[in-house]
């Protein structure tokens, strides 16, 4: 007699490695002969796909080497025409050893910036990675952490990290290593003691001492007003990764002497310098402290630099403190139109900042410093050599008037945020965000160099240095 | 390293007078606020007084007339003179490096105002 | 005078618990020219000076650890930590310095269960 088609082995999961055989097997029970078709995730099995064997009368799938795709769910649907078709489904799960599918590889890495060693893997279960650093497993700490993709990252890289590196990944059915790498710490350039100022007496002998360190050891050149020196004698000495310069003067006349470490990193380099001033004897003049008022910025030249409604400082040593302040920066403004790119931005942002200072709320109305991390950034990163020929065009002279110079900060006379984060002003056109981290370059005292910030856009940009309180 | 190193304090009767000191190292003086705060016994902490990088000093109304906050830039020393002093202004009283916050802190040198 | 009020006087926490203090400022302490708010936080262990945690109502403190957090604005904030260790226990202070007299909270002594 016919008979409706009756499942009587229903499909089960299957685990399967890869590269083995999976079978499914769904007996039914008819008659007549009921046609057996299969499908996985709803798409049919064709019966000339090779990857397929399909065998006692369509009751038996086999899946000759199982890839890592063929994960999902198989059903078998039997009809033969009596009673309605009948379907059975089951889940194939794929099991695959640990396999590392992007290894790490050998990087060399700037000190302070973050690194991240890729360790991709695949496999089923998900293998667990860990990372061996020399011979022992690798511990993390606030600064190293393993992502959940496997990679290795290493925020502010320190000297200490350098070494030789694997991943493993591991999980039930076997462990995978990779291949041992390296990881190099490269550090940038770094005064460790910047020479001192003096003031002498017409004629006397003055040793400017200068010590830098880095990775690897940078050479030290002194610079005499801009120009390379001339007269005196260096004498330099190296001793674990310390360069020290001692370079020994006859002084006649006044002078801007200037160290410079530089080492090299690809082909990129790497500057630290620090100034020390040789002045003669009742030469200075010391400059009078002046006050001022807050009010808004109506200018013209810093409205884009500026935050929108800021209050800033206006200095009441002008008799129209605003049109002086002004002209200030529309002067210096013009000088930046032929600086690099690079250097434009971040001039513009000095200038206007220093100039026109943020107000500090309160009784009085107190002006805020920039920081001097900001403005070494922009002495010695962003526009290292326009610093340089302004230097050397000041000292021989050729500048007119003095007006410029009121518009240029000394940077090792501003507060440091590293001290206190309250006493200065950033300005947040120079921070980075936090895909693109980069660090300052050192500070020209024996402080640590410090890491740009990455501040909400909601702190005010509005910061600088009227001529009252003129760091020049 | 920054370092505050406060002294001066001492035992003294009330109406008396005493002018306390705070030596810092480790950074350029000159260019930050500096701050006196104290706390009595037991209690919470006071602000006094804060001198800005030329010298123009604020004060709580406790103090005013009676404390006199000043500096030394070139002996990297910040000063505060107390006088006419009572019983109440027994504390230990902090020198205190910052702008709008107080960053860093020295160790304190205690004041007792008692016959 | 801006006056601080803050609250609770005392609270008590197991390690890994979230703690929060308030702190109300009697005149808001945020100064619109850079929108900044001059409200600061200090913890002070017992027989140690205290230590600034958070300035400008939320700027963590170079070296503190994230596990502490400071938000709010105008006149109402909170210090929040985020999982209690034993080395918190102290007494945690706010402070205005919108203007001066530059004035604190009374003190929240925050103690181990």
């Known amino acids: 007699l016919p008979k409706a088609p009756v499942i009587t082995t229903p499909l089960e999961t299957v685990d399967a490695l890869v590269e083995e055989v999976a079978t499914f097997m769904c007996a039914v029970e008819s008659y007549p002969q009921p046609e057996i078709s299969w499908t996985r995730n709803k798409i049919l099995i064709k019966l000339f796909d090779t990857r397929y064997s399909i065998r006692e009368n369509g009751q038996l799938l086999t899946i000759l080497s199982v890839e890592d795709s063929d994960d999902g769910i198989y059903c078998c649907t039997a009809n033969n025409g009596v009673g309605g078709a009948v379907e059975s489904c089951g889940a194939l799960q794929v099991k695959m050893k640990p396999k590392i599918t992007r290894p790490p590889i050998n990087v060399k890495i700037i000190e302070g910036l973050k690194a991240v060693l890729p360790c991709t893997t695949m496999g089923n279960p998900k293998p667990s990675v860990s990372w061996i650093k020399g011979d022992s497993p690798l511990r993390e700490n606030s600064r190293t952490a393993v992502l959940e993709s496997g990679s290795l990252r290493i925020h502010n890289v320190q000297k200490e990290d350098a070494g030789q590196y694997r991943c493993v990944a591991k999980n039930s059915l076997g462990t995978a290593y990779s291949k041992v790498v390296k990881l190099e710490v490269e550090v940038f350039a770094r005064i460790l003691r910047a020479p001192e100022s003096h003031n002498v007496t017409f004629g006397s002998f003055v040793t400017l001492h200068c010590t830098a360190t880095g990775i690897p050891v940078p050479t030290i050149t002194w610079i005499e007003n801009g120009n390379a020196v001339s007269s005196g004698s260096i004498q330099e000495s190296v001793k674990d990764r310390v360069i020290d310069s001692r370079l020994q003067l006859f002084i006649t006349k006044p002078g801007l002497y200037t160290c410079i470490a530089t080492n090299k990193h690809g082909e990129k380099f790497s500057t630290a310098k620090a100034a020390a001033t040789v002045s003669i004897a009742e030469w200075s003049k010391p400059q009078k402290d002046n006050k001022g008022y807050c009010a808004q910025y109506r200018g013209e030249v810093c409205n884009a630099v500026l935050a929108k409604d800021a209050l800033v400082f206006l200095n009441t040593s002008y008799a129209d403190p605003e049109e002086a302040q002004e002209l200030l920066v529309h002067t210096a403004w013009n000088e930046l139109k032929v600086v690099s790119p690079l250097c434009r931005p971040a001039a513009e942002a000095l200038l206007c900042n220093h100039v026109f200072q943020e107000c500090s709320p309160g009784v009085v109305p107190t002006p805020i410093p920039i920081c001097r991390e900001y403005c070494l950034a922009v002495k010695e990163l962003f526009c290292a050599k326009e610093w340089l020929a302004m230097e050397e065009k000041t000292h021989r002279g050729l500048y007119r008037s003095e007006m410029h110079l009121l518009s240029v900060p000394e940077c090792s006379k501003l507060p440091s945020m590293h001290w206190d984060p309250t006493a200065c002003a950033r300005l947040p056109h120079l921070d980075y965000n936090k895909e693109n981290p980069k660090t300052f370059p050192p500070m020209t005292s024996s402080k640590p160099s410090v890491d740009i910030p990455n501040l909400p856009s909601s702190s005010s940009s509005s910061f600088s240095v009227s001529p009252t309180y003129s760091m020049t | 390293e920054v370092q505050l190193v406060e002294s001066g304090g001492g035992l003294v009767q009330p109406g008396g007078s005493l002018s306390l000191s705070c030596v810092a190292s480790?950074?350029?003086?000159?260019?930050?606020?500096m701050n006196w705060v104290r706390q009595a016994p037991g209690k919470g902490l006071e602000w006094l007084s804060v001198?800005?990088?030329?010298?123009?000093?604020y004060y709580a109304d406790s103090v005013k007339g009676r404390f006199t906050i000043s500096r030394d830039n070139v002996k990297n020393t910040l000063y505060l003179q107390l006088n006419n002093l009572k019983p109440e202004d027994t504390a230990l009283y902090y020198c205190?490096?910052?702008?709008?916050?107080?960053?860093?802190w020295g160790q304190g040198t205690q004041v007792t105002v008692s016959s | 005078d801006i006056v601080m009020t803050q609250s609770p006087s005392s609270v008590t926490a197991s390690a890994g618990e979230r703690v929060t203090i308030n702190c109300r400022s009697s005149?808001?302490?945020?100064?619109?020219?850079?929108?900044?708010?001059?409200l600061n936080w200090y913890q002070q262990r017992l027989g140690q000076s205290p230590r600034l945690l958070i300035y400008?109502?939320?700027a963590r403190e170079s070296g503190v650890p994230d596990r502490f957090s400071g938000s709010g604005s105008t006149t109402n904030f909170t210090l929040t930590i985020s999982s209690f260790q034993p080395e918190d226990a102290a007494v945690y202070y706010c402070?205005?310095?919108?203007?001066?007299?530059?004035?604190f909270g009374s003190g929240t002594r925050l103690e181990i269960k």
């Open positions: 402070q205005q310095s919108y203007k001066p007299p530059y004035g």
């Open positions: 005149q808001s302490v945020l100064y619109s020219s850079n929108q900044k708010n001059y």
């Open positions: 480790g950074f350029t003086f000159s260019l930050y606020y």
């Open positions: 400008w109502a939320s």
């Open positions: 205190v490096l910052g702008r709008t916050a107080l960053v860093r």
């Open positions: 001198i800005d990088t030329h010298s123009i000093a």
